[in-house]
Interface confidence: medium
């Protein structure tokens, strides 16, 4: 089938004190392989302080998928979910404590 | 890979403030982190500061948070840094470089601006 | 903050020699992700600096395949196999694992 671009949706939820845990959903892509993965500063965080989800079909023939992780408090303006899907990339920041969700359809 | 445009050059008086421009053109602004950086004549580098356009976030070198403020204009796709209480230890070339960190890369200031001379004289 | 010391201060060349600049940081430059972030720039008279070599080894795209990048650690080299002309001015060691991001002191390859 043809390429379908991801819908990418970043979420915060407090953790232990002083932490949040962020993360960022992929849903209804087409095909299968995506990049989804945390950003500190712009560069990646390692693979084990991030926990992914696996990539499942949505019903739709299309795919979902997550990526999350826990931050401090007050830093959440140094990360970003960063997401690579047929060629194409975008960046996504982590929303504000007041606005909990930020949904970005990348073109 | 695009066009990083900087302002023209700055002769100031010490104590003053003065706010350098780095006008973009050429790739997707607010995916990008923009750097600026320090040069004294015949002297090596210093980083200053990042601004993820996206979202005006940023991160300081401690040495100069006193001294710079970055900010971002989205619709004008232009980077700022104010510099105040300017000294003459200020004078500098001062750059704004573009980091490449999609896919793999990792790259950090992979296109730059030419400068902005900035001279703190009485 | 990581200090980086490049040697040679100066490098005098013949054009077709090849050249090797040193490059050793004051502790690991690993990254919590694992990679190494060191970086080579190179400098002209007058102009903006511009990236060789990214992550120890990597060209950056454009840069002929006489630079090349190597080393682990804290000791890192940069060499050039055959020096022309557009190679000559000052070279920058850069670590970004560690904020504040820092440049080594730089090393100026000139005709001997």
């Known amino acids: 089938g043809s390429t379908v671009p991801p819908m990418v949706n970043v979420t915060r939820s407090e953790a232990s004190e002083g932490n949040i845990t962020v993360t960022c959903r992929a849903s209804s892509f087409y095909p299968r392989n995506i990049i989804l993965t945390w950003r500190q500063d712009g560069v990646s965080l390692s693979h084990d302080t991030q926990q992914w989800g696996d990539v499942l079909p949505d019903g739709n023939g299309t795919y979902q998928t997550w990526v999350a992780t826990r931050i401090c408090r007050g830093e959440e303006q140094r990360f970003t979910c960063y997401m690579e899907h047929s060629g194409n990339h975008s960046t996504h920041p982590v929303p504000s404590g007041n606005s909990h969700h930020h949904h970005h359809h990348h073109h | 890979q695009g066009q990083m445009q900087q302002s023209g050059a700055e002769l100031v008086k010490p104590g003053a403030s003065v706010k350098l421009s780095c006008k973009t053109s050429?790739?997707?602004?607010?995916?990008?982190?923009i750097s600026w950086l320090k040069q004294k004549p015949g002297q090596s580098l210093e980083w200053i500061a990042w601004?993820?356009?996206?979202?005006?976030?940023?991160s300081y070198n401690q040495k100069f948070r006193d001294k710079a403020q970055l900010t971002v204009d989205t619709s004008s796709r232009t980077a700022y840094m104010q510099l105040s209480s300017l000294t003459t230890e200020d004078s500098a070339i001062y750059y704004c470089?573009?980091?490449?960190?999609?896919?793999?890369?990792?790259?950090?200031?992979?296109?730059w601006g030419r400068g902005t001379l900035v001279t703190v004289s009485a | 903050d990581v200090l980086m010391t490049q040697t040679p201060l100066s490098l005098p060349v013949s054009l077709g020699d090849q050249a090797s600049i040193s490059c050793r940081s004051s502790?690991?430059?690993?990254?919590?992700?694992?990679?190494?972030?060191l970086e080579w720039y190179l400098q002209k008279p007058g102009q903006s600096p511009k990236l060789l070599i990214y992550?120890?080894?990597n060209r950056f795209s454009g840069v002929p395949d006489r630079f090349s990048g190597s080393g682990s650690g804290t000791d890192f080299t940069l060499k050039i196999s055959r020096v022309e002309a557009e190679d000559l001015g000052v070279y920058y060691c850069?670590?970004?694992?560690?904020?504040?991001?820092?440049f080594g002191g730089g090393t100026k390859v000139e005709i001997k």
């Open positions: 470089a573009r980091h490449d960190y999609y896919g793999t890369s990792g790259a950090w200031f992979a296109y």
């Open positions: 050429g790739f997707t602004f607010s995916d990008n982190y």
């Open positions: 601004i993820y356009a996206g979202t005006g976030g940023s």
């Open positions: 502790q690991h430059i690993v990254h919590s992700n694992e990679n190494t972030y």
């Open positions: 992550k120890v080894s």
């Open positions: 850069f670590q970004g694992s560690h904020v504040p991001w820092t």
